[in-house]
Each structure stands twice: as C-alpha cells, then as structure tokens.
C-alpha cells in the first residue's frame, strides 16, 4: 500500500495548562523507518517527539505504538504552555545506510493555538 | 539494574503441557513490547512469539501457532508463555527477551531449560 | 533465510567482519547478539542496523545496505571470542528471524 501520513486537523485551539492531541496516521509502515514529530520547519525545528523510546516530557503516544501493524502516530501534550504554540509536523523516515535517516514525506502540518487560562 | 528472570521449565513428557514466566524487573514493563527465542541443543537461536506492550496483539512463529500462547500482566510485572502439546522437538532453553522500538531486543533473560521425554 | 559464515578466526588487534545476507533493506531491520557459551545469555551487540547498547565497547559497531548486514569488530580481543547471531525483524510480515551463527575464534 502507497505511504500516506495524514493529519487530519489543521488547527487546534488548547487553553495554557491543559492538554491537547495531535492526531497523525499512516497508510504503510514500509519502508521500515522511524516516525517523528516537529514544530516548525527548516533547519530551526524542534524535534517534539520520535517513536524511538526515548523519554519526552510532557508529551506521550495516544495509541500503542509496540504494536507491530500500529498506524496510529498520535501525540498528547500535556500542560500545554504559550512557548508550545506553533505548527506541528508528523515525519515519516526511511532508514538510513548510515547516518541521518532520510525524510519521505511528511503530514500537512497541524498548528496549535494556546489560549490564555480563563481567570 | 535491569533484569529478566525466566522459570517454570523442567522435564515433561509428550503431550503434556507447561507454562512458563519471566520476571521482569529496573525498567517500565508496561512501556515495552517483549518476546519469547528458544535454543534447542547444539542449534541457533528461534524467535517464538510477541506481544505488543499493552498486550492486545500476539504474534506467533507458524511452527508454534495453536500450541503456544503468550501473555502478560503488567500489574505484576511478568510475561508468560503456556506451551500446549509438546514433543521432544520443543526441548530448548528458552528466553524472554525485551524489544525495541523497532522489534529488535536489547535485553535477554538468563534462560529456563524445558526437556521434553518419555 | 538470513545467511551468515559458520566460523571466522583472527589475532587479537585485527579487524573482523561477519556479514549477514537475505534481507530486504526496504522492510528489515537487523541486530547482533553475542553468545559466549552454548545456553548462556545473549547479549545484544548491536540493534537497529548501528546502534549500540551504551554498555558494548566501541569496537563493536554495525551497518546495513542492500540486502545484508555486517558486524564489525576493531582490534578484537580475546574476550570476543563467542557465537554471533544475526537477527532480522521484516516489517512486512511482522516476523523475527535469526542467522546460524558465527563462531569467532581469537587465536
């Protein structure tokens, strides 16, 4: 099956302190390679999340991702503050004979508004 | 310190069954997808069975589907793999070993030795 | 299958390859486990195609291309001297599988 990586949401509006989920979903797992989530583009990016093991604060995958035939990429952030603000990307990558993996596509992108706590 | 610790082999016959556990300990199980690899004697290392890290889905090598089930209790901190209708050719050591993100493993118990005879 | 050298020999100091063929690259990842006595542990030296366990000495390392994975060790040692088996796990078919083994013998 052709690999797809889709972000259904274009938008989401999360009040600061409370959490938020980025939804992402893929068609294929192949080629085998890893999936990350960044904010913003380019060079600056943040890398936000990779489903890689290792230990991200604040942010933690919705679906079982051990799961051998998972397609659900989705990420909660948790204790969403203003700094968090911005577009997010979910990444598919394609392992790499050496060093860097290779990026094949990547979802539309889904940004987040943070809105003031209500007092 | 991270640590996998395999029992409940020991000798049955033919046809008989046996349930064995692995003990797992110094990382967050319920974090980790986990398997079963068996080594008959004098031969290589034979990939058995997976589960995912919630334990929902199972996967199976051909060879031991139907006969084999693996489970876990992540209350409890444990795997397990209950082995049905055994024959002479299920006699190995057998390990529990931890996955990686990738469904390769990174850390493997010390072993449980299963003989089975008549 | 995967394929892999029944035995390889070197002196202490050399650089040994152990190559390990039949998989996919586009579905496959690989490992390397050590083993230094039949029925003892494994222990993994390398997973993910070239990741090492922050407990494995850097003489150990590996890479994947094509259809095949090698395991190198720089300036073996005596201590080296074990079974090595590759695995593979096939994104395709959700499958594990494993190589014979390498038998590395340190004159």
């Known amino acids: 099956k052709e690999l797809k990586v889709t972000q259904p949401e274009k938008s989401v509006s999360v009040a600061a302190g409370d959490s938020t989920v980025l939804n992402c979903t893929l068609t294929s797992l192949l080629p085998v390679g890893p999936i990350k989530w960044y904010r913003g583009v380019g060079q600056s990016r943040l890398l936000i999340y990779s489903f890689t093991g290792e230990h991200f604060p604040r942010v933690t995958n919705v679906s079982d991702a051990t799961k051998r035939n998972n397609m659900d990429f989705s990420i909660r952030i948790s204790n969403v503050t203003p700094e968090d603000a911005g577009t997010y990307y979910c990444v598919k990558f394609q392992k790499g004979p050496s060093e860097p993996d290779t990026e094949i596509q990547s979802g539309g992108g889904t940004e987040v508004y943070v809105l003031a706590k209500p007092s | 310190d991270l640590q996998l610790v395999e029992s409940g082999g020991g000798v049955v016959r033919p046809g008989e069954s046996l349930r064995l556990s692995c003990a797992a300990s110094?990382?967050?199980?319920?974090?980790?997808?986990m398997s079963w690899v068996r080594q008959a004697p004098g031969k290589g290392l034979e990939w058995l069975a997976g589960?995912?890290?919630?334990?929902?889905?199972?996967y199976y090598i051909d060879s031991v589907k139907g006969r084999f089930t693996i489970s876990r209790d992540n209350s409890k901190n444990s795997l397990y793999l209950q082995m049905n209708s055994l024959t002479a050719e299920d006699t190995a050591v057998y390990y529990c070993?931890?996955?990686?993100?990738?469904?390769?493993?990174?850390?493997w118990g010390l072993g449980t030795l299963v003989t089975v005879s008549s | 299958a995967l394929t892999q050298p029944a035995s390889v020999s070197a002196n202490p100091g050399e650089t040994v390859k152990i190559i390990c063929s039949g998989g996919?690259?586009?579905?496959?990842?690989y490992g390397w486990y050590q083993q230094k006595s039949p029925g003892s542990a494994p222990v993994t030296v390398i997973?993910?195609?070239?990741k090492r366990p922050s407990d494995i000495p850097s003489r150990f390392s590996g890479s994947a291309s094509g259809s095949a994975a090698t395991l190198t060790i720089t300036g073996v040692r005596v201590e080296d001297e074990a079974v090595y088996f590759c695995?593979?796990?096939?994104?395709?078919?959700?499958?594990?599988?494993f190589g014979a083994g390498t038998t590395l013998t340190v004159l």
């Open positions: 110094g990382f967050t199980f319920s974090s980790y997808a």
């Open positions: 695995g593979a796990y096939d994104g395709r078919t959700y499958i594990n599988t």
């Open positions: 996919d690259y586009y579905s496959t990842y």
């Open positions: 070993a931890r996955e990686t993100w990738n469904h390769l493993f990174d850390y």
């Open positions: 589960i995912s890290a919630g334990g929902s889905d199972t």
């Open positions: 997973h993910s195609d070239d």
